[in-house]
Interface confidence: low
């Protein structure tokens, strides 16, 4: 006859490990007992358990409550055992010795491998600001046994660098994602993907990118200067910019205080019925914690009576 076992048994931390040992004998052969021992512990063999055909299972004190026989029905030639709740320290070489009648003793070894799945963590880098050079966006660390794989999933353009540290029974892998911040990255997901044989599926942690920026300011409302004439109602100037964090707006007049009746409403400057007093240079000041921008425009309120001659000239010239 011969023993059937596995070269390697692999389990995930906390799972039960089945250590197989089956005697495939000739007709009429019987198994008297099966002895299980750990054989790589450094101090000779360490007994786990003894399965006796007549007296049942005896577990050594060091493994009390952790070694069981597989659930019935059981084949009398099957000397397999279950090692409950595998921990990293269980990783190593195990031997089963089978005493048979009349063929004598047989032994076989197997290696138990305990996978320790990683628990990844993602740490954002320093605050991202448009105009910076290559900057750390985030780093992702995962420790496990064997070493996990750490990659990035994102549509953002960047570079990655990885390093690993080996510990006695595991390895920690850290991957960093660097990028050149731009406003188009705002709100984009940056996902750390951790793969490991002990995981049923990849673990993913997503960080949402926040890039501080402030766009150039511009003022709308003066596209048609001819609309800015005495008596016109509802005239307004609107300051256009975009930023992260969202910017605040402030309006001033360069050549004096804002005329009475002019309303400031955030990015909008609303005018009462226009008079020549509203002519002047207006400045929109946009700012956030990152930066500030200015845009100025000249308002020239037209007097239709002064311009009536010009209008006629233009018509006759055509």
């Amino acid at each position: 006859g011969e023993l059937e076992t596995s070269d390697v048994v692999t389990v995930v931390l906390g799972q039960d490990a089945k250590l197989p040992c089956f005697y495939r004998g000739d007709s009429g052969e019987q198994v008297g007992q099966v002895a299980w021992a750990r054989v790589d512990a450094g101090e000779g063999a360490q007994e786990l358990a003894l399965l006796h055909s007549k007296y049942g299972l005896h577990v050594s004190p060091a493994y009390e409550g952790r070694v069981e026989q597989p659930p019935p029905p059981r084949n009398p030639l099957d000397g397999s055992v279950l090692l409950r709740n595998a921990v990293q320290a269980d990783e190593g070489e195990y031997e089963c010795r089978v005493s048979t009648f009349p063929a004598g003793s047989f032994q076989a070894r197997l290696r138990l491998r305990v996978l320790v799945p990683p628990l990844p963590s993602l740490n954002p880098g320093p605050a991202l600001e448009e105009g910076q050079g290559l900057t750390l966006a985030a780093s992702c660390t995962a420790e496990g046994s064997p070493a996990p794989s750490v990659t990035w999933d994102t549509e953002v353009k960047g570079t990655t660098s990885s390093r690993s540290f080996k510990h006695s029974r595991s390895a920690a892998v850290t991957s960093e994602f660097h990028l050149v911040p731009s406003r188009s990255m705002n709100g984009q997901p940056l996902t750390c993907v951790v793969s490991h044989p002990g995981l049923l599926q990849d673990q993913r942690i997503t960080h949402i990118l926040h890039v501080s920026f402030l766009a150039e300011a511009s003022v709308r409302g003066l596209e048609d200067q001819n609309l800015w004439h005495i008596g016109r109602e509802g005239a307004m100037l609107k300051c256009l910019s975009e930023g992260q964090p969202p910017p605040s707006y402030n309006w001033t007049r360069l050549d004096g205080p804002l005329p009475s009746g002019v309303r400031v409403d955030g990015d909008t400057l609303g005018f009462p019925p226009l008079t020549t007093e509203h002519s002047g240079i207006y400045v929109c000041h946009v700012s956030n914690e990152f930066s500030s921008r200015d845009s100025q425009v000249t308002v020239d309120v037209l007097d239709p009576q002064e311009d009536s001659g010009k209008q006629v000239d233009l018509v006759s010239a055509s």
């Epitope: 628990l119 705002n186 709100g187 997901p189 996902t191 942690i205 997503t206 960080h207 969202p246």
Partner: antibody
Framework: QVQLKQSGPNLVQPSQSLSITCTVS????????AHWVRQSPGKGLEWLGV???????DYNAAFMSRLSITKDNSKSQVFFKMNSLQADDTAIYYC????????????WGQGTSVTVSS | DFQVTQSPASLSASVGETVTITCRTS??????LAWYQQKQGKSPQLLVY???TLADGVPSRFSGSGSGTQYSLKINSLQPEDFGTYYC?????????FGGGTKLEIK
Amino acid sequence: QVQLKQSGPNLVQPSQSLSITCTVSGFSLTTYGAHWVRQSPGKGLEWLGVIWRGGSTDYNAAFMSRLSITKDNSKSQVFFKMNSLQADDTAIYYCAKIGYDGYAMDNWGQGTSVTVSS
Amino acid sequence: DFQVTQSPASLSASVGETVTITCRTSENIHNYLAWYQQKQGKSPQLLVYNAKTLADGVPSRFSGSGSGTQYSLKINSLQPEDFGTYYCQHFWSSPWTFGGGTKLEIK
């Protein structure tokens, strides 16, 4: 698979506190945080607060003075406590796991129906 | 105050039809938006996050789109199980408000 199981009272006296425990399985609270949301009868959803995986919290300003969210990573439990309840706090209260994107709620508890009445 | 306006408040449609629900925000939320479905007496379920990404297990007849302040959820070829109430939620600046909801009923 991921599960969030809520336990807490269904009836609370006015001016008293509400405590709900959300026990999670299938993921670790050190990897994903949890939101709390409520839904008043016949109404929409109202976001109350969040506890991040690192343990820090953000609350809806409207509830900040009377809301506390804490957790025990080792027991896989998130704890919700709201003080000084009134009749208009009658609602279904939900805990929900933060998803891959770091914000949205990809798994929800079964909800705890709470009536505030004497 | 930050506003999230969801429309329409209710909608009747037949199986096989295509419907679109919209959410408008009072400021640019840079795609920080999720969509949820809730059926009567049940907890909500995530459909879409980051405005456009389908959550695990969500059928491809659902799709999210939009940018800036306007976002929409489109359901192609409505199925009987799609009827319920839909909510959007932004994650731009706290508090992370939900839209008022859209009740999708069978015609």
